[in-house]
């Protein structure tokens, strides 16, 4: 039950995280104009990964896409790449984890397969979260560097004549969304990995050994009680829980109409 809960919670947390990463990637407010020097500006600038925008006090907002690849800073391209990789890995992870969920039965998928899928999706979520955190952190570092550079030479112009007051940019809402979303995806991935351990404890290879008990003898074949079930013989080693007190077949619930989603 705890394993199912951990797996389910990990899935939900990762889902929220990935939705957040997608939202952050699409948001325009990665960097916003620093209003420290001009708190009553009638023009507010903000920039995203894909376009820059200007919001006037009149309510009019104009956004322009970055219609160039070669002209963009390498760091911005790197951040875009990290975020996209994070989204792709996260999406694949979600797809895999849906089939790995213990509460969902797909045909006669065994727990070992579900455990592997849970681990795979968990690792994907962790990498996805790390990509998002890395992407946002790289962008934040770029902002900090540019901020102090523009502060150092606040006024740019020729011959000492003040021409343009440089616009300084500070952290936008998307950065915080990205950090939180990346963290959630990472946490969700860790939870999936923990759930995987619960689904697949250490395998013990049981050899065909005869145990002589008083009165009668029982030969334990590889595969536990599989031979005695109506599903036919199974020659694969099966995991036996609680020191062999009961096999997974004893606790296995048979497919019902509610199991298929």
């Amino acid at each position: 039950m705890a394993v199912t809960a951990c797996q389910g919670l990990g899935f939900v947390v990762s889902l929220i995280g990935i939705a957040g990463i997608i939202a952050a990637t699409c948001m325009d407010q990665w960097s916003t104009q620093d209003l420290y020097n001009n708190p009553v500006t009638a023009v507010f600038n903000y920039q995203g990964l894909w376009r820059s925008c200007v919001r006037e006090s009149s309510g009019f907002t104009e956004c322009r896409g970055y219609f160039t690849l070669l002209g963009l800073p390498a760091m911005l391209q790197a951040v875009r790449a990290l975020m996209i990789v994070g989204i792709v890995l996260g999406a694949i992870g979600l797809l895999v984890s849906i089939f790995a969920l213990k509460c969902i039965r797909i045909g006669s998928m065994e727990d070992s397969a579900k455990a592997n899928m849970t681990l795979t999706s968990g690792i994907m979520f962790i990498v996805s979260g790390l990509c998002a955190i890395a992407g946002v952190s790289v962008f934040a570092n770029m902002l900090v560097t540019n901020f102090w550079m523009s502060t150092a030479n606040m006024y740019t112009g020729m011959g000492g004549m003040v021409q343009t007051v440089q616009t300084r940019y500070t952290f936008g809402a998307a950065l915080f969304v990205g950090w939180v979303a990346g963290g959630l995806t990472l946490i969700g991935g860790v939870m999936m990995c923990i759930a995987c351990r619960g689904l697949a404890p250490e395998e013990t290879n049981y050899k065909a050994v005869s145990y002589h008990a008083s009165g009668h003898s029982v030969a334990y074949k590889p595969g536990g009680f599989k031979a005695s079930t109506g599903f036919g013989s199974n020659t694969k080693n099966k995991k036996i829980y609680d020191g062999g007190a009961r096999t997974e077949d004893e606790v296995q619930s048979y497919p019902s109409k509610h199991d298929y989603v």
Partner: antibody, heavy 118, light 113 residues
């Protein structure tokens, strides 16, 4: 057709109060920021106050800060300017104006005259 | 506050002749985000409210004759009338629309000779 009609002007004694109104029609009032601009007799234009479309942002000129209050009723398509502690230097024609892109004032009312005198 | 200084304060022009009004701001009105200058020009005819002529320093408002043109960037701006007509008389104002308070210039009175 866009129309802005100011009202509420008149003669008032120094220290008195007055409430100006600006009735808007011909456009979606709730989508536009609005301003009050004044012009003293024979003088130039002086910006007075601004209110954003949803009343979230309000700015005042230093000369009226603390004495004047701008507000709006989007349901009634009306802009207001509550003027308290009036001084002789507040005597002017008060115009309401609509805010448009470029942060420009594209439509102006005909103005209402406020005279502060004892 | 941004101080707007207009020159000349008065101008007398013969119909058909060009006219030019200068406007200087104490701070740059150029917004780096969209590379637009937040300066607006208005014309106030006698007994009327002001009328919008040009915004973003050079964009003509719809319905404004093409003889009116705006130019300049940063702190120096100019309004040009290619051929002055009798109906162009009035006071021309430039306005800072970059930061509050949205200050106006003192105005330039255009008269016909």
């Amino acid at each position: 057709d866009v129309q802005l009609v100011e009202s509420g002007g008149g003669l008032v004694q120094p220290g008195g109060s007055l409430r100006l109104s600006c009735a808007a029609s011909g456009f979606t009032f709730s989508s536009f920021g609005m301003h009050w601009v004044r012009q003293a007799p024979g003088k130039g234009l002086e910006w007075v106050a601004f209110i954003s479309s949803g009343s979230h942002t309000i700015y005042y000129a230093d000369s009226v800060k603390g004495r004047f209050s701008i507000s709006r009723d989007n349901a009634k398509n009306t802009l207001f300017l509550q003027m308290n502690s009036l001084r002789a230097e507040d005597t002017a024609v008060y115009y309401c104006a609509r805010f448009q892109y470029g942060n420009s004032f594209d439509y102006w009312g005909q103005g209402t005259l406020v005279t502060v005198s004892s | 506050d941004v101080v707007m200084t207009q020159t000349p304060l008065s101008l007398s022009v013969t119909p058909g002749q060009p006219a030019s009004i200068s406007c200087k701001s104490s701070q740059s009105l150029l917004n780096s985000g969209n590379q637009k200058n937040y300066l607006t020009w208005y014309l106030q005819k006698p007994g009327q409210p002001p009328k919008l002529l040009i915004y973003w320093a050079s964009t003509r408002e719809s319905g404004v004759p093409d003889r009116f043109s705006g130019s300049g960037s940063g702190t120096d701006f100019t309004l040009k009338i290619s051929r002055v007509e009798a109906e162009d008389v009035g006071v021309y104002y430039c306005q800072n629309t970059y930061s509050f308070p949205l200050t106006f210039g003192q105005g330039t009175k255009l008269e016909i000779k």
